[in-house]
């Protein structure tokens, strides 16, 4: 009888499998695989080699704390003639003496997470078992049978593999691209993502069921949505919007997710201070990409926060057009969430593809602060019964705004306001380019189209179906040049009278600083004038906005809201126009000194010109970039930087990966906050 088969060691072929599975960056010490795809391993036996006629090899793969075959968290499978794609299977690739090369496959619907792989050998009545090692299984956008399959290689590269990108901020009329280091393959990030799954409340409540449900990107997306904020759990980020960030890091100061996730993991899953919508979205994007779900950050301009699902945001103003109070139902200048690509077997056909997931804690969904995934197509069709949270996301892009003016006698009158349309310029980074892609059309039919009316009817959006009033007088806020931080500049109320009558009016112009979520700050410019609008005439009335007025109260959003209220006493009518101005920060210049080569020191010279009338104090540059720096680096400039001159530092980089990388930079000082810059660097082989 043949002697017992004895395993000396197992080579998990980490590097080769990493290349095949697009996980090479994750595969330093661990085997990381994508589900539904073959992988290799080599068994080295002691004494004698494997003999098919006498030896039986059975593999075991388990995940989670309580593995079971019913839950799909435990599998046993034997060697077969060929691997069956889409199921747990194994076959022989090659045999040389005592060395057996095998090919294994995982199902395309296996739960993602950490697995333990074991081998049982039996020869006659003798048997032994061996631990082969651990591997991590991720979603697979390259596998047609996987729920996250994406058939474009360029899109897979962008939405799964690309570690850097842009998040769009600013205002609808001045869209600002902010570079971000997602860094989903950086050291420790995969561990943090798996830990995030393992501390989520659903896991703590029912570990076995949670691990089983990790086979679904819908489930995982919803868990991530809830875990990126810390409102109900040991989530990653604490949200704060009040401009008091002294005991943490200002949301505007972050330049990447890596630092955030590392802090969270290293401090025992304690909340990281502080996040706002784009930080929540960016961290969710990192986590989802890391787990293998194609994901992108999107920005919706003039985003509504509708709490009572009436698709209506009502503002009450006094006779001067000033808001009576800051309330929770508001229009945010912009709001960010993520979209993840997946099938929706739980929904009707046609609702697969991009799903909106919003990790910013706004409203509870099924008792938890999370939102989505909801089919973007369902939003476009006005199908508000769709899981999950369709009505909330529909409102974010479609709510109507009504302005009421409370007159001195206490009565309220509706004001006409055509300047604010909710859900505009919905933006994401283009595939493979540093440009913005407008994806508004994926959420909304063209304004005024029959399809749009049909959607509003289906969604019972009565306000949007009402005819708009026209008075023959129109007003809009226009801007001049030089709207950058440190400058004085003019804005104009442009008023047109398209009627045959003369109109006696009063114009109240006011500029106030504003946070990106719509909360108003102090006034920084006003004008109150009486004017006569001649028939068929156009008027342009300027409002001067001075640096000395806005400098002390501008938030890190760099936004100023200009409001014009045109009152016509004779007709007892009010016409309102608003515009959000984004003040451009100075440009960060980045020069690369030397030739960028892999595993060789590289120096970046980073500079910024002081645009203000006084010196800049307490200046700090912070840089990071996946493949360029092991961790974030900060360089302080202890000496003041006088007006008009540059602040300049040199930073040592150590590129580890060849190819295209982005060096992302943040600059902070006393009077300039969260100035961002980036530079593309192509690293060549050594």
């Amino acid at each position: 009888m043949a002697e017992e088969l004895n395993l000396e060691r197992c080579d998990l072929e980490i590097q080769a499998n990493g290349r095949d599975h697009h996980t090479a960056d994750l595969c330093q010490e661990k085997l990381v695989l994508r589900r539904g795809q073959r992988f290799r391993l080599t068994l080295y036996f002691e004494g004698r080699g494997y003999e098919a006629s006498v030896d039986r090899l059975t593999f075991g793969a388990v995940t989670g704390p309580d593995p079971s075959e019913e839950a799909g968290t435990k599998a046993r499978f034997s060697l077969s003639d060929d691997v069956e794609e889409g199921s747990w299977s194994a076959s022989v690739l090659d045999q040389q003496d005592n060395v057996l090369s095998l090919q294994l496959c995982t199902p395309a619907n296996a739960p993602v997470g950490q697995y333990r792989l074991s081998l049982e050998t039996s020869t006659g009545y003798q048997g032994s078992s061996f631990m082969l090692g651990h591997f991590i299984l991720l979603f697979n956008a390259w596998c047609p049978a996987d729920d996250v399959y994406l058939d474009s290689e360029a899109e897979r590269r962008e939405y799964v593999l690309t570690q850097q990108g842009f998040i769009y901020q600013g205002s609808v009329k001045f869209i600002k691209s902010v570079p971000w280091n997602f860094g989903q393959f950086e050291d420790g990030i995969l561990d943090a993502c798996l830990m995030l799954l393992d501390v989520n409340p659903k896991f703590l409540k029912d570990r076995s069921r949670d691990c089983s449900r990790r086979s679904s990107p819908i489930y995982v997306g919803r868990v991530v949505s809830g875990m990126v904020n810390c409102n109900d759990d040991q989530g990653v980020l604490l949200g704060r919007w009040d401009n008091n960030y002294g005991d943490g890091i200002s949301p505007m100061a972050w330049i990447g997710s890596v630092d955030i996730l590392r802090r969270w993991k290293e401090h025992g899953c304690q909340q990281v201070k502080y996040g706002q919508c784009w930080v929540f979205a960016a961290v969710a994007c990192t986590v989802l990409r890391c787990l293998g779900i194609p994901t992108r950050v999107v920005t919706n301009y003039n985003s509504a926060h509708d709490q009572n699902s009436n698709l209506l945001i009502e503002y009450f103003r006094n006779e001067y057009g000033e808001l009576e109070s800051n309330k929770s139902e508001m229009i945010w200048n912009f709001h960010c969430w993520v979209e993840s690509w997946m099938t929706r077997p739980d929904l009707q056909p046609g609702y697969e593809g991009w799903q909106a997931i919003d990790p910013t804690p706004q409203e509870k969904s099924e008792g938890t602060y999370c939102c989505g995934p909801v089919s973007v197509r369902a939003i476009k069709e006005g199908d508000l019964s769709t899981k999950y949270d369709a009505s909330f996301v529909f409102a974010e892009v479609n709510a109507d705004v009504v302005d009421w003016i409370r007159q001195s006698d206490g009565s309220v009158l509706k004001s006409i306001n055509n300047s604010l349309v909710v859900g505009q310029k919905i933006s994401t980074k283009s595939v493979g380019r540093d440009d913005r892609e407008d994806i508004t059309y994926t959420y909304k039919y063209p304004e005024g189209s029959p399809e749009e009316r049909e959607v509003f009817t289906r969604a019972n959006h009565l306000n949007k179906l009402a005819e708009k009033e026209e008075t023959g007088v129109a007003m809009r806020i226009r801007v001049g040049d030089g709207m950058s931080l440190g400058n004085d500049f003019d804005v104009f109320a442009h008023i047109g009278n398209d009627t045959s009558e003369s109109r006696e009016c009063r114009l109240l112009l006011c500029a106030r600083t504003v946070s990106y979520n719509g909360v108003l700050g102090p006034e920084c410019g006003t004008e109150d004038i009486n004017l006569t609008l001649d028939p068929y005439s156009e008027n342009s009335i300027p409002l001067r906005i001075l640096y000395e007025k806005y400098s002390g109260c501008l938030t890190e959003s760099n936004l100023i809201k200009v409001r014009g209220l045109l009152v016509e006493p004779a007709a007892n009518s009010y016409l309102l126009a608003e515009r959000d101005l984004y003040l451009e920060n100075p440009e960060i210049k980045i020069r690369i000194l030397g030739e960028p080569k892999q595993n060789r020191k590289l120096v970046a010279e980073v500079s910024l010109k002081n645009p203000l009338s006084d010196s800049l104090y307490d200046c700090v540059f912070t840089v990071e970039g996946a493949g360029l720096t092991k961790e974030q680096k900060s360089v302080e400039v202890s000496d003041p930087v006088p007006a008009g001159d540059a602040v300049k530092v040199r930073v040592d980089l150590f590129p580890t990966d060849i190819g295209l990388h982005k060096l992302v930079v943040n600059f902070q000082c006393d009077k300039l906050k969260s100035v961002k810059g980036y530079r593309n660097i192509i690293i060549g082989p050594a």
Epitope: G552, D614, D639, A646, K648
Partner: antibody, heavy 114, light 112 residues
Amino acid sequence: EVQLQQSGPELVKPGASVKMSCRASGYTFTTYVIHWVKQKPGQGLEWIGYINPYNDGARYNEKFKGKATLTSDKSSTTAYMELSSLTSEDSAVYYCARLSSDYWGQGTTLTVSS
Amino acid sequence: DVLMTQNPLSLPVSLGDQASISCRSSRSIEHSNGNTYLEWYLQKPGQSPKFLIYKVSNRFSGVPDRFSGSGSGTDFTLRISSVEAEDLGVYYCFQGSHVPFTFGGGTKLEIK
């Protein structure tokens, strides 16, 4: 017109503390830092430190740490310097200034004498 | 700290003469951005100092063109091409490149 108006002369006993003021007008107070400079009788100028009214951040010459405390009050557009544990060595004229410009206070004379 | 040393301590001149005052720093006062923030001030008896020159050689507005500054690295000079009575007083150099900022000891310009 930009002006820095300093408080009047002080005569104090050794060991005591004194707080002198510098009221700024004619410009936005939070836009510029205010420096303090010491000049002992018949001697040269010595930089004490600055206060940044924008964020209340102060930087000091190491020599004056523990001796001088710089603060500011936005509502009254006033910068203050408090000097503690006074000795005769602290007798001097103290100027507030917006350095790198021609805006200086008229000086506050401090005499420390028992 | 950067030590600023002025020479001479006292400079007697006749009206109409040229005057040169030297200022030497104990180490380079070039800022990390490449600029040198070396300034000159004039203090007349009983008055606050007046601002004359910034960034080594730039005259502040209203300063007569008989005043000129030069130098680099650690050696700097203030020149008055033709001294007038209103120029008398104590001249101070000042470095604003590195905290703590420092003044020179002063040079007294007086009539011979």
